[in-house]
């Protein structure tokens, strides 16, 4: 999808022109003199994330589709794979290997010309924002965090289902009904709609030409590509529509005016393109059909949207018309259609995000409202953790309850627990385990959000099948949570894979702020008063040497956490004593790259293990680097 990932892989190339048409590419090559081997790269208009290579030879332009493989490599059909479009072009400058000739001279974009963004690119940001806002009813920081953390998944979701929001897509209606709808209202040649034919991903394009409605079948092949019979193949319906709004290419005529669903007002903005002979006024706008869309409305998750009505042309070809598919297309019904996203879970937003749930002024909770299960989930420094249920004003919330050891009535420990509670109650971020409150009953209890799958290190030890893409996604989420802590002037001090809990295989939360202390805004570190039990292998040198803890020392710990994650939960510095680890670090040595870990991720670990705290990046930089790599890999 010409997403940030795709654009990054080619935008920097001076001979990459973006989303230009085949004809435009040919015009550029003519401008460049059409010498043999003159070439340029453009974005594929029918394959998500793909490219097209346009090469001059024998005074003619030859075009090759470059597809993006599932593993993120690039290849011309039947050719060898390459890590990037640039690598592919470099290879073909030395080997023709199926091309009409060697690539000899790139035709670079003229001065001031930027790669052209596709029509969907302009729409995508808005579509994603609206989709997230309305599907999960998010706003503010929760909305921003959702978009950042799930952008690749959301882009894919939007790209492959965007047609369901388009005014020309009428869902599953009969051939007869589609004809009648097309014939309601203006009779512009090229007026069209697309309807779903069956549940196997087959569609029909209904096109008005000289008062008659023509039906073209759109089939999906085994790889999911869409095409009219004998026609060009596309990844998405909106790409197909965009293509046929530029050229007929097998249809009787180009697509001009989308036949809107009855009762869907103001979805299309026409105007801007020169009037075409014989076309309806207000037909065209710069950039084809897609770029005319200017508003969207998304159904709420799990809600059926009732359908609107349509029109009849038997005795009248009037102008009346409302419609919408029977089941709201993007009503993320949380059914089997897709893997659950973090936003689908109950712990993405604070339980107090619901205005009807009043956040108690006190950190203390009523013990009578808390029910505990017998089974222990685990045990930690403070005691055991059990699953429980807390009766809130509106809902019963599944919670994890830390039960303090009875002998821990030691005032110092009690203070530590209260400190943890006060710290945690101030924190509210999707990638942090939120604290609901504390109970003083048979024991002290800390009531927190539930993360069913448990610690990251244990999960990865038991689930070696988890792909590195998935691990990148999870560590990116941890970096987002830590960036939030850094912005909130909180130092974690015990960041490790054991303190990252999984809600789902694709959703991580940072837990255990047992050693956290709120920084005063004007301080960037504080000195630990006593040694205690220190997790030295996760500590930055300045913590060990000078007891100085800061968000920068959390960055060091994050590097170790990354190493644990890519090692599938192995213990860091295996078999070494704390003193040996310290000596190793002083010598400038670091842990090796885990088997199968991407080089970029190991480079980032090493950056986190920068000895000098001043030169070590903060979480803002770490998160951005992870984000960019994550987008690139997932796309």
């Amino acid at each position: 999808m010409a997403s940030s990932g795709m654009a990054d892989s080619a935008n920097h190339l001076p001979f990459f022109f973006g989303n230009i048409t085949r004809e435009e590419a040919e015009d550029y090559l003519v401008q460049g003199g059409m010498s043999d081997g003159l070439y340029l790269l453009r974005q594929s208009r029918n394959y998500l994330g793909g490219f097209a290579l346009s090469v001059a030879h024998g005074r003619k332009a030859h075009h090759y589709t470059i597809e993006r493989e599932l593993n993120g490599t690039y290849a011309i059909a039947g050719g060898r794979t390459h890590a990037s479009p640039a690598d592919l072009c470099h290879y073909h400058s030395q080997e023709s290997d199926g091309l009409v000739c060697l690539l000899k001279k790139p035709f670079n974009r003229p001065q001031g010309v930027q790669p052209k963004t596709g029509p969907f690119e302009d729409l995508k940001e808005n579509l994603i924002r609206e989709y997230v806002k309305q599907t999960w009813n998010l706003q503010g920081q929760a909305l921003e965090q959702a978009i950042i953390s799930q952008k690749p998944q959301l882009e894919k979701l939007i790209a492959t289902t965007a047609h369901e929001k388009m005014p020309w897509f009428h869902g599953k209606i009969s051939r007869e009904e589609s004809e009648q709808i097309v014939l309601i209202g203006s009779k512009t040649n090229g007026k069209f709609l697309i309807r779903a034919r069956d549940n196997n991903g087959s569609y029909a394009l209904c096109l008005l030409h000289e008062g008659k409605v023509l039906h073209y079948r759109i089939d999906k092949d085994k790889t999911g590509k869409l095409s009219i019979p004998e026609g060009k193949k596309f990844d998405t319906l909106w790409q197909l529509v965009e293509h046929y709004s530029y050229k007929a290419d097998g249809l009787l005529r180009v697509l001009t005016v989308p036949c809107q669903k009855i009762g869907t007002q103001g979805n299309v903005n026409f105007g801007g393109r020169p009037q075409l002979p014989g076309s309806h006024p207000a037909t065209w706008s710069a950039g084809g059909i897609i770029s005319r869309i200017k508003s969207y409305s998304f159904p709420k998750p799990g809600h059926r949207k009732s359908s609107p009505a349509q029109g009849n042309r038997q005795e009248s070809t009037v102008s009346f018309n409302p419609y919408e598919p029977e089941l709201a297309p993007w009503a993320a019904d949380k059914g089997p259609q897709r893997e659950a996203l973090p936003m689908d879970t109950e712990v993405y937003e604070s339980p107090y995000a619901d205005p009807e749930e009043i956040r108690p002024k006190e950190v203390y909770l009523d013990r009578k409202l808390l029910t505990l299960e017998d089974k222990e989930l685990g045990s930690g420094n403070f005691g055991t953790v059990k699953k429980g249920y807390y009766q809130m004003k509106k809902v019963v919330k599944t919670v994890a309850v830390k039960i303090l050891k009875n002998e821990a009535n030691d005032p110092a420990l009690k203070d530590e627990l209260l400190a943890e509670a006060n710290v945690m109650q101030q924190l509210d971020n999707p990638y942090i385990v939120r604290m609901i409150g504390i109970c003083e009953a048979e024991s002290w209890m800390l009531v927190m959000e539930m993360a069913e799958l448990g610690p990251l290190n244990k999960y990865l030890q038991q689930n070696r099948h988890v792909k590195d893409k998935n691990i990148i996604e999870l560590v990116h989420q941890v970096s987002m949570g830590m960036k939030y802590l850094e912005e909130s002037n909180f130092v974690h001090r015990d960041l490790a894979a054991r303190n990252v809990l999984l809600v789902t295989q694709h959703y991580a939360k940072i837990s255990d702020f047992g050693l956290s202390k709120a920084l005063r805004a004007d301080e960037n570190y504080y000195k630990a008063q006593t040694h205690g039990k220190w997790p030295v292998k996760w500590y930055a040198p300045e913590c060990i040497n000078y007891y100085k803890f800061s968000s920068k020392s959390d960055v060091w710990s994050f590097g170790v956490l990354m190493w644990e994650a890519f090692s599938y939960g192995q213990k860091p510095y295996r078999g070494m004593k704390g003193s040996e680890v310290t000596a190793m670090l002083e010598k400038g040595e670091r842990m090796g790259c885990p088997a199968g870990c991407p080089r970029e991720m190991y480079d980032l670990m090493n950056l986190c293990w920068t000895y000098d705290v001043e030169n070590r990046p903060g979480f803002a930089a770490v998160e951005l680097r992870l984000r960019n790599y994550y987008y690139d890999v997932v796309n």
């Epitope: 005014p167 209606i173 009969s174 007869e176 009904e177 009648q180 309601i184 209202g185 203006s186 512009t188 005016v257 809107q260 669903k261 009855i262 009762g263 869907t264 007002q265 103001g266 299309v268 309806h280 006024p281 207000a282 009732s306 359908s307 609107p308 009505a309 349509q310 029109g311 009849n312 042309r313 038997q314 005795e315 009248s316 070809t317 009037v318 102008s319 009346f320 018309n321 409302p322 419609y323 029977e326």
Partner: antibody, heavy 115, light 110 residues
Framework: QVQLQESGPGLVKPSDTLSLTCAVS?????????WGWIRQPPGKGLEWIGY???????YYNPSLKSRVTISVDKSKNQFSLKLSSVTAADTAVYYC????????WGQGTLVTVSS | QSVLTQPPSASGTPGQRVTISCSGS????????VYWYQQLPGTAPKLLIY???QRPSGVPDRFSGSKSGTSASLAISGLRSEDEADYYC???????????FGGGTKLTVL
Amino acid sequence: QVQLQESGPGLVKPSDTLSLTCAVSGYSISSSNWWGWIRQPPGKGLEWIGYIYHSGSTYYNPSLKSRVTISVDKSKNQFSLKLSSVTAADTAVYYCARNVGFHDWGQGTLVTVSS
Amino acid sequence: QSVLTQPPSASGTPGQRVTISCSGSSSNIGSNYVYWYQQLPGTAPKLLIYRNNQRPSGVPDRFSGSKSGTSASLAISGLRSEDEADYYCAAWDDSLASPVFGGGTKLTVL
């Protein structure tokens, strides 16, 4: 000759659901593709509420969409309108009609929303 | 506020010819058919003109419709007292994707 006849309660309480039925005679409901509802508040103009296609697809006025449901019962040769959460502003004469262009109309039924 | 604009009232004497106008925009009247309905006092509307100028059977030829650009008009010649009624124009609106009506014109036969 097609005839349409609206029926339903003439008085509905605020916040309740208004329910009307349009019985079609002299014509099979499956023979004409579009059936519609229109309303006219006292002393005011006409407002389109929605259509139902004989197959059951429904199309509504966006301003009423969240509250309207139109359904068809082919066995009884009738179609119905439900309008939820009514207020005094929904007081009107409600008409059912045939065809997109409203070629034939029922005689209308006055529905008053009042407690 | 109606999408199509009609004068609120019109009048004429028996035998006279009166015209009722209806103005819209390119997305409705400009690109689609116009319909006219007659509503006699205390009765339901009745289709008078469809597809700009077509009369359903039973409608006298004294009633005629025309359209030009984004406006349409209904002409009634040989005005009779039984023509006293409200008259509504309607058209399909492509941008609203729905039928739209005029506010209605009350015709008084003096």
